[in-house]
Amino acid sequence: KSEMPQPVSIQDINHRVWVLQDQILIAVPRKDRVSPVTISLISCRHVETLEKDRGNPIYLGLNGLNLCLMCAKAGDQPTLQLKEKDIMDLYNQPEPVKSFLFYHSQSGRNSTFESVAFPGWFIAVSSEGGCPLILTQELGKANTTDFGLTMLF
C-alpha cells in the first residue's frame, strides 16, 4: 500500500486539463499559457472495509495546495467541492472518510472516479469545455467521465 501521495497529471479524452480558478476546478484545453494543477492521489488504507469490485478507493488532492476533492449534497444533488484539507490527514484517519473518497477504475488507458459517498456519481466535465468539474450519473452523454492519468515522478 502506498503511504505517500502519488502526483499525477489528469486530462480528459478531449485533451483538456484541470485548472484551478477561484478555488474551483475547471477543464480547459491544454495551451502554452495554461498551468494545469498536479493532482495527488493516495489509496485509502482501510481498503478492506470498502466495496471490492468498484475500483481502488483513493483520496484526491491538489499537490502542494492543501485542497482535496470531496462530495457533498447541495439540496438533493451531490456536488463536487474543494475543501481545505491535508490529504495525509484523510489517509491517516481511523475510518474511511467517504465524502473524500473515490473509486478509481481503470479500463485500458481510461480512468473513472466514482464517489464512494454517492455510488453511481462520477467526476465529469461538460463536453463544452471551460466548465467546472461536476458529479454526474449520466455516463458518456453530455459529460465526459473518462480521464487519462500520467504518473509524475
Epitope: E48, K85, Q93, P94, E95, V97, K98, S99
Partner: antibody, heavy 121, light 109 residues
C-alpha cells in the same frame, strides 16, 4: 432530531442468543458508521465492533469475533447486534453509537440509551 | 491487546481546572491513536466530547480541550461547572481496533 433508540432489556439463559436493535431517526444510517460498545456492571466500556451500513462491512474487536454479529436493515434505518453462546460474563449494558466525521475528525456524537442483557440460569 | 488506563477518580473545585489522562500499555500515546473522549452523566445519554486527540465535537463547550501530555492523551477541563460532574471515558485506536479506558469519575466539589 438525531436519536438512537434501542430495544428493551433482555433476560437470557446461558448458551442462548440475543438480538439487540438500534433504530436511528433524524439521519440515514448509510451516511455514517454505527459502533457497538458494552459496559459490564462496575466496569469500563468495551468496544465490540462497528458496521458500515451503506455496504455492510464490519470490524470486530478480536475478543468478540465469533461472539457478536453486526447487521443493519437500511429500509428501517436500524442496526442490530446479535450475541451467541451467552455466558454470565456477557451480562452488561450494550450501547450503539454513531461515529461520524465532522470537520476534521471522527466523533462519537450520538448514543443509544443502552440495553441491559442479563444472562442467568 | 493494549490496555488503556485512566485515573479512577478525580475531584475539582467549581471554577477550577483539572486534567484527566489516558495511558497506553504499549507506550506513548500519539496522534495516530486518534484519542476520543466521551462523557456519561447520571441518568443521561453518553456524549462525545473530543475526537482526533484535540478536536472538540460540535456543540461541546470550549472549557473542554484535548491534548497529548507526557506521552498520554489528556482531557483538560478549565473552569469546571457543577454540571461537569460525570464519568469520562477515553478510547484509543490501535490500527484497526479501538480500546476504551476504565473511565474517570469526576467530582465537582
Amino acid at each position: 432530531q438525531v436519536q438512537l433508540v434501542q430495544s428493551g432489556a433482555e433476560v437470557k439463559k446461558p448458551g442462548a442468543s440475543v438480538k439487540v436493535s438500534c433504530k436511528a431517526s433524524g439521519f440515514n444510517i448509510k451516511d455514517t458508521y454505527i459502533y457497538w460498545v458494552r459496559q459490564a456492571p462496575g466496569q469500563g466500556l468495551e468496544w465490540i465492533g462497528r458496521i458500515d451500513p451503506a455496504i455492510g462491512t464490519t470490524r470486530y474487536d478480536p475478543k468478540f469475533q465469533g461472539k457478536a454479529t453486526l447487521t443493519t436493515d437500511t429500509s428501517t434505518n436500524t442496526a442490530y447486534l446479535e450475541l451467541s453462546s451467552l455466558r454470565s460474563e456477557d451480562t452488561a449494558v450494550y450501547y450503539c453509537a454513531r461515529y461520524d466525521y465532522s470537520g476534521s475528525s471522527f466523533y462519537f456524537d450520538y448514543w443509544g440509551q443502552g440495553t441491559l442483557v442479563t444472562v442467568s440460569s | 491487546q493494549a490496555v488503556v488506563t485512566q485515573e479512577p477518580s478525580l475531584t475539582v473545585s467549581p471554577g477550577g481546572t483539572v486534567t484527566l489522562t489516558c495511558r497506553s500499555s504499549t507506550g506513548a500515546v500519539t496522534t495516530s491513536n486518534y484519542a476520543n473522549w466521551v462523557q456519561e452523566k447520571p441518568g443521561q445519554l453518553f456524549t462525545g466530547l473530543i475526537g482526533g486527540t484535540n478536536d472538540r465535537a460540535p456543540g461541546v463547550p470550549a472549557r473542554f480541550s484535548g491534548s497529548l501530555l507526557g506521552g498520554k492523551a489528556a482531557l483538560t477541563l478549565s473552569g469546571a461547572q457543577p454540571e461537569d460532574e460525570a464519568d469520562y471515558f477515553c478510547a484509543l485506536w490501535y490500527s484497526n481496533h479501538l480500546v476504551f479506558g476504565g473511565g474517570t469519575k469526576l467530582t465537582v466539589l
